[in-house]
Structure formats: structure tokens, C-alpha cells
């Protein structure tokens, strides 16, 4: 007996698609061996049509694929645009076609349903609207108009022109009699249910001279579109339900046990906790279509998703719906990176963001997820030299280390920086990742003075004290600007006296600005790194003023202004820019959204997504090599 299992019979109609799942014991050998789908010939033999090693027969070109799910012990063969020629006996199997590790599948493709005599066939999707047209002759113009549904042997009245409506159709049916010029009445049924399917008879008049017309209503449950995405990647569900529901609440739900479809997100403000920080529902278009983006895909996100429209914001019978079956591939091309990064108030974090290494020239972005309403993600910084105004001097996006990873450094952390951030590019939309920043108690490791004032034409020396734990790290000073942080020469002044219980390995490294000019004003960072991987940073603002007294200035820690955690940028005096991430390709419909709200105002609560990949110690963020 073969251990392979699958459907013995598959019946479909021309033009349809099939999705055939074959099950195998998920041993390590089976998981990685060749998977195939072949057609059995009359004289034995089995001709391969598609295999997991990339082969696709010319018969299947452009209309079939085979996807292996090693973690489930299944592979799926999708075949589209079926024709009757596809009918036959097939095998799905592992290894070599002739080896016997296979399962026999009979595929039968029949002709689509033909028209019955004098019967108009209406094929409509579940939840949508159908208009059944019923012609009549002049002699029946003033007579009763009615629509019956054939239930078994008996016609049951559905609606008539005297005002009767069958209780099963209350609130979703109407009978329209056209103007006198047209000998036609119409019955419009909204929010179609599967139970509405069947044979209908419309009639004008009740005697032997009545006009009758047969109608066959077929209500289609939407076939789920199969979506395959990588673990840790991103998926976008595009939901187009039609203009008739443009003003009705929209939802995306995930089918769980039973008939339940648990709301993932809806336009009434509901969002499932498991998707906090990693979901956006874009504003809907006038035609009622909308998109939902989910990032940071997890194994447990796999399943059947429905989007729909209903005033309750959740699935009800008669909701127009679209369906997807999401598979999450655990053999992901997207590297592991921490889903939670912790930083000490007053200190910094360095976040590593993966991107598709084939798209090294793409523009990189970092945005802050906001849960209000349907979720949005205003941009904070990009790789083209744009930084949101209130992040000047404390946020930088670096192309390093490159080759599939970029780095975002955020310093001068306060509790308001806690939240979810997205890494993305204007290239491959599947490579959107989410990281949660948590602010923890503790002291910054690097010690620098507070804001410093330099005098024009004089020399300024700014100290940065590095504890001994950073003895093996490269220490640097740099001047921040919108495009990054340009390295500056610095001097090692020997061991620092700023740390208790710290041996000779602590270091005081100074930045010296000779003959200060106005151009020297701005933000300076001192920090540590190992190669291209960045660690903790500390920021100092240097102001430049006219000469008051001669001599150079040497700034000590004692002259520091406010503690870093108390320092809040006053953004009230300048216009606040806001690029909102409605693209790059996040929502292609709206490239940028102007928003004059100050994102620095109002605290953001941190939401713990229960990540098992937390990363502790703000000084260790650069250790995660890919």
C-alpha cells in the first residue's frame, strides 16, 4: 500500500481551476524528495506534467503550478483553465514516476451547464444582487405579476405585485414594473444566499392566457484564491465587492472552527489582537474596493480568509464575499530578524531590516504603525535623504550592512517611541517586516554632555564615555544629516573616569571641532559598531554662537543640560511634514497623504505581541548577523 493519499476523484467544469492536495508522511527524506504530477497513458507509463524541480509540460505552461509544504507533509497541484481534454487518470507522487510511491487521481472535466428550453440562467456570486427580467404581453399589462420558486414539485410564491413578500426574502427583494412603453417587469433580489439558488417562474396574469418565463438562479460560493506567502513576509488581500456596497462596513475575517469567521479587521474599528502592529486596512475607493496588508506572517496565520461587506462589520448570510486560502511557507526566503527590540530610555536602538537582496537599489523606508481607525503607517525616514521633521537628529537609515539588510538607528529614546515599526522598500512588497520597540528601565551605556554651545572661530572638544563592555568595539563620532551620519576624526583620551567598577578598558573618546564655523552647528553622534553592524549611539546638539570670551571650550559631563529622557523636541514652531505610507506599493492608489498632526504628541502605549524572539540589552542590537 502506498503511503501517499489524495482525492480519488476530482470533478469540475470547463474553464474552472482545480487544486489537488496530495498528502505524504513528512519524513525528512520525503520532505525534500521530488514531487510530481503525471498523466497515466493507455499502455501503462506516466508522463510527467509538472514537478517540484521546476519542470512544466507544454500542456500546462502558464496554467499550472506545484507547491510543496514540507512542514505539513503535503504538496498542492493547481491547474487552471480546465478543458475536457484534461479529463483522465493521473498520479501524484514522490521520487521517480515508476517507483510506486504515488496515488491515483481521476480528473473529470465536463462541459459547462447548458441552457434549458426557454430558461434564462442567472449565475451570481453569493451576497450579490440579481435582476430577473420577466417579459409579458399587452393583455396582461394590468394583471398581477408574480415570481415563484420551485420547491420540490410545488411552486412557492416569492413576491407579487399586490405587495406580498415571502418571509425568506424580507428586506432584500423588490418587484419593479417598467414604464408603460416596456412590457417587462423585474424582480431584484439583494444579498443572495446559497439557499436562493434554484428554479424560478415569473408570471404575468393568473389564467390560461398568462405569460410565463423560467429562470434558473445559480448562486456561487466564491472559490478561494490560493495565496502562497513566505513566513515572516507580507500578504495583501485586494477586496473588490462592487459599488453597490461602497457605503457598507467592510471586514476581513478568518474562518476558525465551525461557521465562525473571526474578524481580523473591519472598517468599524475592530482589529484582532494577534494582528496588532502588523495590519493595515487601506481607505476604500469609491467603488467599494479596499486592501488589507498583513506583515510579519506567522505559521498560525495560514487559513481561509473572507472579505465582505455587512453593516455589522462581520460575516452574515447574504454578505457579498471574496475568499482566499493562505498558505504560509516555512521554508522562507525572508531571514529571521528580531520581532522585538528593547531600548533604554535616553539611549538608542539599532534595527536590522531585511529586504530582497536582488533589489539593492530600491528605496528603503521605515514607518511607524498607528492603530487608530483602520491603521496607517506614516513614514519616518527613507534612504533618499528624507527624515520626518520631529525625528531630525535622532533617526538615521543606513544602507549598511547591505546585501539584503539595512539598518535604522533611533536614539534619544523616550516612552513615546514604544510601538510597532515597519521596514519596507519600493520594490518587492512581500518583504515588509514588523518590529516592536519596547522601552525598558535602565541607564544609557554611553555618556555624553547635554546640549553644547560652541563659539565661532574657537575649538570645541566634546567627550563621549564608553564603558568597558565596549572595549572590543569600534568607537566613532559622526555628524548627523538627513542622508546619514558622516564619520569624523576623534581622539582616544584613555580610560574614562565616568564609570564605577569599570577597569582600564573603559574609554573616553573626544570629538574636536577646530575653528568652529556656523556649518558646525547640528547634531553629533557618538557610537559603537562592529564592522557594518551598529550598536548603541548617543546624540549631542552643538549650537554655535558669537565669540564672548577668548579660548577653547572643553565640555564636561557636568555641564550637560537636561537628561536625555527629559529632552523633548519642540516641534510647535515649525510646520510638521508627514509622508504617510500609502505606497511605496503599500497602497498604490495613494502615493502620499498630507497630515498636519504632530506625530510626536500623545503617548503611544506598547502592545506586547507575545513574540518569542525578543532581543534584550540595547547595546546588543548589532549582533544579529544574517
Amino acid at each position: 500500500k502506498s503511503p501517499i493519499f489524495g482525492p480519488e476523484e476530482v470533478n469540475s467544469v470547463e474553464g474552472n481551476s482545480v487544486s489537488i492536495t496530495c498528502y505524504y508522511p513528512p519524513t525528512s527524506v520525503n520532505r525534500h524528495t521530488r514531487k510530481y504530477w503525471c498523466r497515466q497513458g493507455a499502455r501503462g507509463g506516466c508522463i510527467t506534467l509538472i514537478s517540484s524541480e521546476g519542470y512544466v509540460s507544454s500542456k500546462y505552461a502558464g496554467r499550472a503550478n506545484l507547491t510543496n509544504f514540507p512542514e505539513n507533509g503535503t504538496f498542492v497541484v493547481n491547474i487552471a483553465q480546465l478543458s475536457q481534454d484534461d479529463s483522465g487518470r493521473y498520479k501524484c507522487g514522490l521520487g521517480i514516476n515508476s517507483r510506486g510511491l504515488s496515488f491515483d487521481v481521476s480528473l473529470e472535466v465536463s462541459q459547462g451547464p447548458g441552457l434549458l428550453n426557454d430558461t434564462k440562467v442567472y449565475t451570481v456570486d453569493l451576497g450579490r444582487t440579481v435582476t430577473i427580467n420577466c417579459p409579458f404581453k399587452t393583455e396582461n399589462a394590468q394583471k398581477r405579476k408574480s415570481l415563484y420558486k420551485q420547491i420540490g414539485l410545488y411552486p412557492v410564491l416569492v413576491i407579487d405585485s399586490s405587495g406580498y413578500v415571502n418571509p425568506n426574502y424580507t428586506g432584500r427583494i423588490r418587484l419593479d414594473i417598467q414604464g408603460t412603453g416596456q412590457l417587462l417587469f423585474s424582480v431584484v433580489i439583494n444579498q443572495l444566499r446559497l439557499s436562493d439558488a434554484g428554479q424560478y417562474l415569473c408570471q404575468a396574469g393568473d389564467d390560461s392566457n398568462s405569460n410565463k418565463k423560467n429562470a434558473d438562479l445559480q448562486v456561487l460560493k466564491p472559490e478561494p484564491e490560493l495565496v502562497y506567502e513566505d513566513l515572516r513576509g507580507s500578504v495583501t488581500f485586494h477586496c473588490a465587492l462592487g459599488p453597490e456596497v461602497a457605503n457598507v462596513a467592510k471586514f476581513l475575517c478568518r474562518q476558525s472552527s465551525g461557521e465562525n469567521c473571526d474578524v481580523v479587521v473591519n472598517t468599524l474599528g475592530k482589529r484582532a489582537p494577534a494582528f496588532e502592529g502588523r495590519i493595515l486596512l487601506n481607505p476604500q475607493d469609491k467603488d467599494g474596493s479596499f486592501s488589507v496588508v498583513i506583515t510579519g506572517l506567522r505559521k498560525e496565520d495560514a487559513g481561509r480568509y473572507l472579505c465582505g461587506a455587512h453593516s455589522d462589520g462581520q460575516l452574515q448570510e447574504g454578505s457579498p464575499i471574496q475568499a482566499w486560502q493562505l498558505f504560509v511557507n516555512e521554508e522562507s526566503t525572508i531571514p529571521r530578524s528580531p520581532t522585538v527590540v528593547k531600548g533604554v530610555a535616553g539611549s538608542s536602538v539599532a534595527v536590522l531590516c531585511p529586504y530582497n537582496r536582488k533589489e539593492s537599489k530600491s528605496i528603503k523606508y521605515w514607518c511607524l504603525w498607528e492603530g487608530a481607525q483602520n491603521g496607517r503607517c506614516p513614514l519616518l525616514v527613507d534612504s533618499e535623504g528624507w527624515v520626518k521633521a520631529q525625528y531630525e537628529g535622532r533617526l538615521s537609515l543606513l544602507e549598511e550592512p547591505g546585501n539584503g539588510t539595512f539598518t535604522v538607528i533611533l536614539n534619544q529614546l523616550t516612552s513615546r517611541d514604544a510601538g510597532f515599526y515597519w521596514c519596507l522598500t519600493n520594490g518587492d512588497t512581500l518583504w515588509r517586516t514588523t518590529v516592536e520597540i519596547k522601552i525598558i528601565e535602565g541607564e544609557p551605556n554611553l555618556k555624553v554632555p547635554g546640549n553644547v554651545t560652541a563659539v565661532l572661530g574657537e575649538t570645541l572638544k566634546v567627550p563621549c564615555h564608553f564603558p568597558c563592555k565596549f572595549s572590543s568595539y569600534e568607537k566613532y563620532w559622526c555628524k548627523w544629516n538627513n542622508t546619514g551620519c558622516q564619520a569624523l576624526p576623534s581622539q582616544d583620551e584613555g580610560p574614562s573616569k565616568a564609570f564605577v567598577n569599570c577597569d582600564e578598558n573603559s574609554r573616553l573618546v573626544s570629538l574636536t571641532l577646530n575653528l568652529v564655523t556656523r556649518a558646525d552647528e547640528g547634531w553629533y553622534w557618538c557610537g559603537v559598531k562592529q564592522g557594518h553592524f551598529y550598536g548603541e549611539t548617543a546624540a549631542v546638539y552643538v549650537a554655535v554662537e558669537e565669540r564672548k570670551a577668548a579660548g577653547s571650550r572643553d565640555v564636561s559631563l557636568a555641564k550637560a543640560d537636561a537628561a536625555p529622557d527629559e529632552k523633548v523636541l519642540d516641534s510647535g514652531f515649525r510646520e510638521i511634514e508627514n509622508k504617510a505610507i500609502q505606497d511605496p506599493r503599500l497602497f498604490a492608489e495613494e502615493k502620499a497623504v498630507a497630515d498636519t498632526r504632530d506625530q510626536a504628541d500623545g503617548s503611544r502605549a506598547s502592545v506586547d505581541s507575545g513574540s518569542s524572539e525578543e532581543q534584550g540589552g540595547s547595546s546588543r542590537h548589532h549582533h544579529h548577523h544574517h
Epitope: V10, S12, P224, R304
Partner: nanobody
Amino acid sequence: QVQLVESGGGLVQAGDSLRLSCAASGRTFTTYGMGWFRQAPGKEREFVTTITWSGSTNYKYYADSVKGRFTISRDNAKNTVYLQMNSLKPDDTAVYYCAASTVLRDPRVPTEYDYWGQGTQVTVSS
């Protein structure tokens, strides 16, 4: 909720045929697959056959022990699934349960099914 009601069980001779029906009612618009399991006294519940559907495509799965003898079918309009059992054997004696699922990852696994009927007894005498 979805309610399932089985009928058609009974006592037959070996070699005879029997047709079981399973009528579904309630919120059947969310169901995706329906099937039959059976349980003989003192034994585990075992998979017999399942039919799943997507639009106008049907997929039929059978256990090795019933292949070629049992046939599953459905009547969409009546929300009913049928199990035609031919060439019955004494080994087929069991309580036959109808089951329905909204999301079916592996049709052979009972825990994948969300709704169950009360069962109908099939006895095959030699």
C-alpha cells in the same frame, strides 16, 4: 450552527447495498467539506470517505478499505450528502457518522471536522 442528520442505516446481508443520507441545515454557507466516519464497538472512529467542494469542483476522498465499493455524492440544492455502499461485508458493521468542516487540512483526521451527526447504525450479517 450547522445541524447534521443521518438516515438510511439498517440491517443487511453481506453483499447487499445500502444508501445513507446526511442532511445539513443551519449556516451551511460556511461549510467546505462533508464526509463519513465509522466506529465499530471497541474501536477508534475511522475515516470512510469525504467530499469537499470549491465552486463547481468536487473532490472525493476514500479510505483504502472501501475503495471501489462505496461512493460519496452530494446534492447541493438539498444540502445533502449521500453514501452509496455496495458489496457490504460484515467488517463494515459500525455506527456511521456524518461530519462537516469549514476548513479542511486533512480529510482523514476527525479533529478537522467542526460538526457531527448523531450517527446511524449499519449492521451487515454474514
